[in-house]
Amino acid sequence: EKAMVDGSWLDLAKRSKLEAQPFAHLTINATDIPSGSHKVSLSSWYHDRGWAKISNMTFSNGKLIVNQDGFYYLYANICFRHHETSGDLATEYLQLMVYVTKTSIKIPSSHTLMKGGSTKYWSGNSEFHFYSINVGGFFKLRSGEEISIEVSNPSLLDPDQDATYFGAFKVRDID
């Protein structure tokens, strides 16, 4: 009987630790996408609607803030698209990029953790163009550090929640 009680306590402890594991999945806020063709920071993301969820992390001022030290898997998926119904591209040669950046407040510094993308030729003769970037990686993050997303050509972002998103989840503690 004691062994059974110990086992269930162990399960409970495991489960509560699992439930406390920080994670976030943030989706683009389509109503507030900046315009421009240069690199801009995307600050408007959903954290609590549709596929978007957050737990034991904080979303503030366009940045995902780490609340617990640990090793995290970070990921970002960015889709760019253009359909001729919205007009013509002013240039057919495009650099479509995403940058995942870590900012530390304690020691003011900023580092690009991941980048991805390509230069593209989107011919004016085509009705529709689409390009997707996915980046992911494993990083040691400290409490208070902030993760943000920058992209080029934000006016070409696909605003759907299944197209443009980023997130993180803690994989293990720092020993």
Epitope: S35, G36, T85, G87, D88, L89, A90, T91, S155, L156
Partner: antibody, heavy 126, light 103 residues
Framework: QVQLVQSGAEVRKPGASVKVSCKAS????????IHWVRQAPGQRLEWMGW????????KFSQKFQGRITVTRDTAASTAYMELRSLRSEDTAVYYC???????????????????WGQGTLVTVSS | EIVMTQSPSSLSASVGDRVTITCRAS??????LNWYQLKPGKAPRLLIY???SLQSGVPSRFSGSGSGAEFTLTISSLQPEDIATYYC?????FGQGTKVEIK
């Protein structure tokens, strides 16, 4: 205030060419595209082409491809539209119009024509 | 190629009347639809862009609605200075125009 001032009326014989100018003022010429639109007597408005005043990129209607050239002089804040091999059905009022999209802010030619020139009547007659 | 069709081609109304012009696209164009006013010998004027946004300086009696393939321009109270031809436009395609006259 934003103004587009076009050159005066022209009369040409069939087979000849015409070049219409469009001088912009009141805004940074290089930051916007200029479109050319015409209206023949009793006809609907007809889009001809655009030029991105910043980089000189152009796009033309298939109908005018090979007959039209659009250029710009950024120092003079002026766009030019030349139409060659004129025929009687090219008799129309030719307009230049500014695209509303600022190219510093975005890369889409939006086809919202927020300011127009006063029009240039081109008559093609033998 | 998208074709824009306007109706009616002309209309006659009294000052103060509510006037409605319809524009149909041959396929869905989302909300990428603009309305212009043309008066003889004058530069055309953008009234409505993006189906329903009023261009700066345009009187509030003008309004636009619709999305997909069907759009409407409404003049809530026709004024003598509104006598003109009105055109809908999506990118490279214009409607054939609606001539508005006073009764």
């Amino acid at each position: 205030q934003v103004q587009l001032v076009q050159s005066g009326a022209e009369v040409r014989k069939p087979g000849a060419s015409v070049k219409v100018s469009c001088k912009a003022s009141g805004y940074d010429f290089s930051n916007y595209a200029i479109h050319w639109v015409r209206q023949a007597p009793g006809q609907r408005l007809e889009w001809m082409g655009w030029i991105n005043a910043g980089n000189g990129n152009t796009k033309f209607s298939q109908k005018f491809q090979g007959r039209i050239t659009v250029t710009r002089d950024t120092a003079a804040s002026t766009a030019y539209m030349e139409l060659r091999s004129l025929r009687s059905e090219d008799t129309a009022v030719y307009y230049c119009a500014r695209d509303s999209e600022n190219m510093v802010r975005g890369i889409i030619i939006a086809y919202y024509f927020d300011y127009w020139g006063q029009g240039t009547l081109v008559t093609v007659s033998s | 190629e998208i074709v824009m069709t306007q109706s009616p081609s002309s209309l006659s109304a009294s000052v103060g009347d509510r006037v409605t012009i319809t524009c149909r696209a041959s396929q869905s164009i989302s909300r990428y639809l603009n309305w212009y006013q043309l008066k003889p010998g004058k530069a055309p004027r953008l009234l409505i862009y993006g189906a329903s946004s009023l261009q700066s300086g345009v009187p509030s009696r003008f309004s636009g609605s619709g999305s997909g393939a069907e759009f409407t321009l409404t003049i809530s109270s026709l004024q003598p200075e509104d006598i003109a031809t009105y055109y809908c436009q999506h990118t490279r395609a214009f409607g054939q125009g609606t001539k508005v006259e006073i009764k």
